[in-house]
């Protein structure tokens, strides 16, 4: 006999919630794998910055995305399938995963706050490499997509460390409308915007982290309530 009443409502709420979570994970994983395995991006491994081999911050970022997407899909599946099948085992595993993820988020938050300058530096390097790839290999649509995301999200274009060729390509093709790369030495410098995000606008990242943490706690409560409801319904 299945769960009834309010518990049934929780069951479907948990299912929908985790289905969306699973889908989001799938999208992130798909995009990350596309970025990683597309031949144009793979060329980045063999790219040279002047006479020095390019550091692979670009790939580190992509591997983080792959991991995040995979974990989201796995946890989403556990919640989804556990709720619809009314499986105490799956829901218990789901709850355990959420507790681990919550602990990881708290740890990552503390680590991120302590190392925010290094993270900002890595994000800038990631942007520079994506931009370099988009210019050097003008067929690299994935790198162009990364650059476009940076430009539109941060409302910036380029940086004060650009090469002549990159400046020319950006000016003609890759700056969001309204931003003027030619304005006094890049007023809308993406490096500056990234620094601003990790210093002045750190509260935005904090708010996002709190929202994610609240959702996790909410899901933990729902999964426990449903688990108890399943146990109680199986008694009768």
């Amino acid at each position: 006999m299945g769960v009834e009443g309010c518990t049934k409502c929780i069951k479907y709420l948990l299912f929908v919630f985790n289905f969306v979570f699973w889908l989001a994970g799938g999208v992130i994983l798909g995009v990350a794998l596309w970025l990683r395995h597309d031949p144009q991006t793979t060329n980045l491994l063999y790219l040279e910055l002047g006479d020095k081999p390019a550091p692979n911050t670009f790939y580190v970022g992509i591997y983080i995305l792959i991991a995040v997407g995979a974990v989201m899909m796995f946890v989403g599946f556990l919640g989804c399938y556990g709720a619809i099948q009314e499986s105490q085992c799956l829901l218990g595993t789901f709850f355990t995963c959420l507790v681990i993820l919550f602990a990881c988020e708290v740890a990552a938050g503390i680590w991120g706050f302590v190392n925010k300058d290094q993270i900002a530096k890595d994000v800038k390097q990631f942007y520079d490499q994506a931009l370099q790839q988009a210019v050097v290999d003008d067929d690299a649509n994935n790198a162009k997509a990364v650059v476009k995301t940076f430009h539109e999200t941060l409302d910036c274009c380029g940086s004060s460390t650009l090469t002549a060729l990159t400046t020319s390509v950006l000016k003609n093709n890759a700056c969001p409308s309204g931003s003027n790369i030619i304005s006094n030495l890049f007023k809308e410098d993406c490096h500056q915007k990234i620094d601003d995000l990790f210093s002045g606008k750190l509260y935005l990242i904090g708010i996002a982290a709190i929202v994610v943490a609240v959702i996790m706690i909410f899901e933990m409560i729902l999964s426990m309530v449903l688990c108890c409801g399943i146990r109680n319904s199986s008694v009768y």
Partner: antibody, heavy 119, light 112 residues
């Protein structure tokens, strides 16, 4: 050895057209930006245009914008410059040059081809 | 009138040290764009001599050196030889004009 060989220059009347070619060898043409630079007789160098490796990006000097068109055929390792509505001030030796992304400059040049615009 | 200003001529005797200047502005050399130098021997195509302000491509003798300070760059040739007689051009990128810019060129004459 990197080689760039321009051809197609000659005498043309004002308002006329000409198409320059630049045959290349000794480097992976299809993965390099290419450019045209010109030099009027007894004068200095002037950048004319560039084109990206897969022809996605290109740009021109204001003095030739709307009249000149740069293109490439990666299967033939050849760069082109289509010049229309030619003027007397376009008279120059036209050099094709490879653009090095790493060094951010024109690292290899052809020997040039002379274009004379005169009536 | 070139965006980058070079002296029209320079001269020196064999063995001497000669310096050629290249003056730009805050929209090209001063904006952080690298300065490059090209040598054009009589009747030939330009050849890259110095790139990235002070780097020599392989095959270029260490008698040639480049430097940059503020909105100016300079090319120094030490131990001058007769085969150094040529036109020398500096080149950078101008962010206001959005074009690659060259100096007007300096004709170097080796005397004696």
């Amino acid at each position: 050895e990197v080689q760039l060989l321009e051809s197609g220059g000659g005498l043309v009347q004002p308002g006329g057209s000409l198409r320059l070619s630049c045959a290349t060898s000794g480097f992976p043409f299809s993965s390099n930006y290419m450019s045209w630079v010109r030099q009027a007789p007894g004068k200095g160098l002037e950048w004319v245009s560039y084109i990206s490796s897969s022809s996605t990006y290109s740009d021109y000097a204001d003095s030739v914008k709307g009249r000149f068109s740069i293109s490439r055929d990666n299967s033939k390792n050849t760069l082109y410059l289509q010049m229309n509505s030619l003027r007397a001030e376009d008279t120059a030796v036209y050099y094709c040059a490879r653009y090095s992304y790493g060094r951010d400059n024109f690292d290899y040049w052809g020997q040039g081809t002379l274009v004379t615009v005169s009536s | 009138q070139s965006v980058l200003t070079q002296p029209s001529s320079a001269s020196g005797t064999p063995g001497q040290r000669v310096t050629i200047s290249c003056t730009g502005s805050t929209s090209n050399i001063g904006a952080g764009y690298a300065t490059h130098w090209y040598q054009q021997l009589p009747g030939t195509a330009p050849k890259l001599l110095i790139y990235g302000n002070s780097n020599r491509p392989s095959g270029v003798p260490d008698r040639f050196s480049g430097s940059k300070s503020g909105t100016s760059a300079s090319l120094a040739i030490s131990g001058l030889r007769s085969e150094d007689e040529a036109d020398y051009y500096c080149q950078s990128y101008d962010t206001n004009l959005s074009v690659w810019v060259f100096g007007g060129g300096t004709k170097l004459t080796v005397l004696g």
